[in-house]
């Protein structure tokens, strides 16, 4: 066959769907690879062809669109499963072509099983809620396009295994789950099960997401440098190892980049000739507040090094702060000598 622009296997779109549930999968060509949409392609006389490679096979084969009850069908640029089966797992290819043009892309589809508590190998999206912040909501994701607006589905929400119906700070409101006051105890996996009728059959869509309660912007502060501070003096003799920790607390801030760095005499350590190493460690609180520690280390400090200015800097979306470490050379202890007085005898 003639040449076809092959975009290869689009592993960025690792699509996971639950077994025995409807799934609608859009051809990624129009979403990520081509500059025109399906309607434009269709009106230009291009045809969209689907085929697949079963799991652990190399053979490309056409998709069977003649299954009972139209279990697999195509509608415009969407491949429909009503519902999926476990052995639908494989690599799917959509190809757009006419006599003069061809473009195709493949993507992996994994049909996964879930247990009665909705546990599965599915990768879960994470939704962050601010602690004690007022009413916040999560929305049942990826259910658009499964049923027309005239159909009123029933939606049941679960936290873990338990139906949400006896929680005093969480209200199920259809596709939304409203948290009146998000608390650490609200951390966990939340599942919405959407049930809707279609052509005399009942289908279920299961969507699980992880809720993580994080620090509130109401409580957010600029970075706080705990060390170095005015109470600790780093007093060293030449030849000793100098270790200065810079420990900074950062309030959780959505999409904020937290930075900690040292300057020595106003320059970054990389820009000076002395042999400095910096090791960083990061820890998080339950609400994702962050503590960063950068330890500045000079293995064998010189008297020149002990005269330098060592400043720890920190920056977040809330502001920038700096603190100098108190470094000094240890004054040698006075060496007391005993002089023996001779010849002071009386004459």
């Amino acid at each position: 066959s003639e040449r076809c622009d092959d975009w290869g296997l689009d592993t960025m779109r690792q699509i996971q769907v639950f077994e025995d549930e409807p799934a609608r999968i859009k051809c990624p060509l129009f979403e990520h690879f081509l500059k025109f949409n399906y309607s434009t392609a269709h009106s230009a006389g291009l045809t969209l062809i689907w085929y697949w490679t079963r799991q652990d096979r190399d053979l490309e084969e056409p998709i069977n669109f003649r299954l009972p009850e139209n279990r697999i069908s195509k509608e415009k640029d969407v491949l429909w499963f009503r519902p999926t089966l476990l052995n639908d797992t494989g690599n799917y290819t959509c190809m757009l072509r006419n006599t003069t043009y061809c473009s195709k892309v493949a993507f992996p589809l994994e049909v996964v099983q879930k247990d009665s508590c909705f546990n599965s190998p599915m990768k879960l999206p994470v939704h962050k809620l601010y602690i004690e912040y007022g009413i916040q909501r999560i929305t049942c994701p990826n259910v658009d396009g499964y049923f027309p607006s005239s159909v009123k589905p029933t939606i049941t929400w679960y936290m873990g295994c338990y139906k949400i119906q006896n929680f005093n700070n969480v209200i199920p409101e259809g596709m939304n789950l409203s948290f009146l006051i998000a608390l650490i105890s609200n951390n966990g996996n939340y599942t919405c099960v959407v049930t809707y009728p279609e052509n005399g059959r009942t289908f279920h869509l299961t969507r699980t997401l992880t809720v993580k309660v994080v620090g509130s912007p109401k409580n957010a502060v600029p970075p706080v440098i705990h060390s170095p501070n005015d109470h600790v003096v780093y007093e060293k003799e030449p030849g000793e190892e100098l270790l200065i920790p810079c420990t900074v607390y950062f309030s959780f801030l959505m999409d904020s980049r937290n930075e900690v760095w040292w300057t020595i005499d106003g320059k970054k350590p990389d820009d000076i000739t002395i042999d400095v190493t910096i090791n960083e460690s990061i820890s998080h609180s339950r609400t994702e507040d962050e503590t960063r520690t950068q330890i500045l280390s000079i293995k064998k400090v010189t008297s020149e090094d002990l005269k330098r200015s060592y400043v720890c800097h920190a920056r977040s979306a809330k502001g920038e702060v700096a603190k100098a470490a108190k470094v000094k050379q240890k004054v040698p202890a006075p060496r007391y000598t005993v002089e023996l007085a001779c010849g002071f005898g009386a004459t």
Partner: antibody
Framework: QVQLQESGGDLVQPGGSLRLSCAAS?????????ICWVRQAPGKGLELVAC????????WYASWAKGRFTISRDNSKNTLYLQMNSLRAEDTAVYFC????????????WGQGTLVTVSS | DIVMTQSPSSLSASVGDRVTITCQAS??????LAWFQQKPGQAPKLLIY???TLASGVPSRFSGSGSGTEFTLTISSLQPEDFATYYC???????????????FGQGTKVVIK
């Protein structure tokens, strides 16, 4: 056993102030409960006034109660309060405290009520 | 704010009758509705929460149904101790203002015929 007991109801003149108390026993305010004040005018229906989430102190007020009424709690005393200012004749009612009423759960519990009469 | 409209405001019935009380919400409250029973001089008592879940210790002759804006409390066979006033209570949140709205119905008094 688990119970709520209101106190502080009295006869008060229009424009006056009053503080109601609701003592809880058998459960702790440090746990997560909404505790609310609900009132019922003589021969009339129930009306939610204000609620507080005991563990955090977050509050909710009926729109008409904002400004004049203040709900608070003292977790060390396991007691809920309602401070009522600028009282009017239409505030005359039995005031109940109730647990888990803002969002009703099976843990819902009511006190027996205390009568507030606003009259000159 | 939401408005909960109960009907009828009163009804007379006999022991053994099937009694139905309805509550209509001014907007969609999904299943966030509770039913209470109140007898003279007493505090209200929870019967149903989550529109249809029976509170513990409540006789099975009480049942709740409905979702969205239309709700029903049914007493399948009225008993002498059931003569009382019944209230619905609805709750919802407002997406645009992040407020929570909560309102009781005006009550339905069930009296002996």
């Amino acid at each position: 056993q688990v119970q709520l007991q209101e106190s502080g109801g009295d006869l008060v003149q229009p424009g006056g102030s009053l503080r109601l108390s609701c003592a809880a026993s058998g459960f702790s305010f440090s746990s997560n409960y909404w505790i609310c004040w609900v009132r019922q005018a003589p021969g009339k229906g129930l009306e939610l006034v204000a609620c507080i989430y005991t563990s955090t102190g977050n509050t909710w007020y009926a729109s008409w109660a904002k400004g004049r009424f203040t709900i608070s709690r003292d977790n060390s005393k396991n007691t809920l309060y309602l401070q009522m200012n600028s009282l009017r004749a239409e505030d005359t009612a039995v005031y109940f405290c109730a647990r888990d009423l803002l969002v009703v759960t099976s843990f819902n519990l009511w006190g027996q009520g205390t009568l507030v009469t606003v009259s000159s | 704010d939401i408005v909960m409209t109960q009907s009828p405001s009163s009804l007379s019935a006999s022991v053994g009758d099937r009694v139905t009380i309805t509550c209509q919400a001014s907007e969609d409250i999904y299943s966030n509705l509770a039913w209470f029973q109140q007898k003279p001089g007493q505090a209200p008592k929870l019967l149903i929460y989550g529109a249809s879940t029976l509170a513990s210790g409540v006789p099975s002759r009480f049942s709740g149904s409905g979702s969205g804006t239309e709700f029903t409390l049914t007493i399948s066979s009225l008993q002498p101790e059931d003569f009382a006033t019944y209230y619905c209570l609805g709750v919802c949140t407002d997406i645009s203002t992040d407020d929570l709205y909560n309102a009781f119905g005006q009550g339905t008094k069930v009296v002996i015929k």
